[in-house]
């Protein structure tokens, strides 16, 4: 089951503390299960499981992927996991932590010398292959730091969105990736509806921007639902 | 200053059903995942039920499944916990969870950054 799996999400960030004020950060720590940590004059106590669950690897941390967390595990769920190292086994480039990407199922370094060839031919490879995501498609998408000194501007080759400029995110563009402005209010958006349908984006849209959501627009309620339009709007 | 306050906790019978809500107030950020967590007395605080970003993905703790159901409303910034065929063990405080993030904003690992106060259960049998 889930609650089985690899612990990648252990004590990401921690509750307040007993007595203390709602809505205050926690901080991150890692520990074992049943982490004591102080509140006030008591102590309390945490399971250090805490799935994160995600549709997109934007939505994990930078040193984390999005993915069903077991083979067979769950229909349906995704949480983040953490990042696989250097020589460690992938499917697509977001499973390889920052400075690395994956390279016929092996996470390799982002060598600057490299760079373009290789990263523009795995990324080809992947969009044409089923087998080359966890699920069937492609997400976390940027270069690592390594590649780029300066984060992408809008129409820049990345793999990971986190090496594009602010404001910028890292989406398919034909069988390459790069910056794209990430949308605005009333911007149409795309709302996955099918688990697996990235793969069918030729030019793949950014997600909303800050306090945006994508949403059916109020006119378009009563059309069929494969013609629904989807735009960023106000929470 | 940003605020989660829950709401729907009470008593019920074994076999009663109860809706939590959570609202998250205050802060100019993005909701990205929300959770349930719940603590009984002596035990350690463990994870209920989660939701992702944009609802698709919803993640339930084993005891949980076919029981209870989280959903989101992002217009409301809220997260509800629908509890159903409530047992004894269910009793706890439960407490909701959010990871709010500034935009462009994320963190090296994913998590809930933004926490309520909770709210009691009690299930009688």
């Known amino acids: 089951t889930l609650n089985s799996v690899l612990n990648s999400n252990a004590i990401k960030n921690l509750p307040p503390p007993l007595g203390g004020a709602a809505g205050h950060p926690g901080s991150a720590v890692s520990a074992a299960p049943g982490i004591l940590y102080p509140g006030g004059n008591k102590y309390q106590t945490i399971d250090n499981y805490q799935p994160y669950p995600c549709a997109e690897d934007e939505e994990c941390g930078t040193d984390e992927y999005c993915a069903s967390p077991t083979r067979g595990g769950d229909a349906g769920v995704q949480i983040c996991l953490a990042c696989r190292k250097r020589r460690k086994r992938c499917m697509r480039h977001a499973m390889c932590c920052p400075g690395n990407y994956c390279k016929n199922g092996i996470c390799v370094s982002s060598d600057q010398n490299h760079f373009r060839g290789e990263i523009e031919e795995t990324i080809t490879e992947s969009f044409g292959n089923d087998h080359s995501t966890l699920d069937g498609y492609s997400r976390r998408t940027t270069l690592s730091s390594k590649m780029y000194h300066t984060k992408g501007q809008e129409g820049s080759v990345c793999l990971r969105s986190s090496d594009c400029a602010s404001g910028l995110c890292c989406a398919r563009h034909f069988w390459s990736k790069i910056c794209k402005p990430v949308l605005k209010e009333g911007q149409v958006c795309t709302k996955h509806r099918r688990k697996g349908s990235h793969g069918l984006e030729i030019f793949q849209r950014c997600y909303c921007g800050e306090g945006l959501s994508c949403r059916i627009q109020k006119d378009h309620h009563q059309a069929s639902n494969s013609s629904r339009l989807h735009t960023c709007q106000r929470h | 200053e940003v605020q989660l306050v829950e709401s729907g906790g009470g008593l019920v019978q074994a076999g009663g059903s109860l809706r939590l809500s959570c609202v998250v107030s205050?802060?100019?950020?993005?909701?990205?995942?929300m959770g349930w967590f719940r603590q009984a007395p002596g035990k350690l605080r463990e994870i209920v039920a989660a939701?992702?970003?944009?609802?698709?993905?919803?993640y339930y703790t084993d005891s949980v499944k076919g029981r209870f159901t989280i959903s989101r409303d992002d217009a409301k910034k809220t997260v509800y916990l629908q509890m159903n065929s409530l047992k004894s063990e269910d009793t706890a405080v439960y407490y909701c969870?959010?990871?709010?993030?500034?935009?462009?904003?994320?963190?090296?690992?994913?998590?809930?950054?933004?926490w309520g106060q909770g709210t009691q259960v009690t299930v009688s049998s």
């Open positions: 205050g802060g100019t950020f993005s909701v990205y995942a």
């Open positions: 939701i992702s970003r944009t609802g698709s993905s919803i």
């Open positions: 969870a959010v990871d709010g993030r500034a935009n462009g904003e994320r963190p090296a690992v994913a998590g809930y950054n933004y």
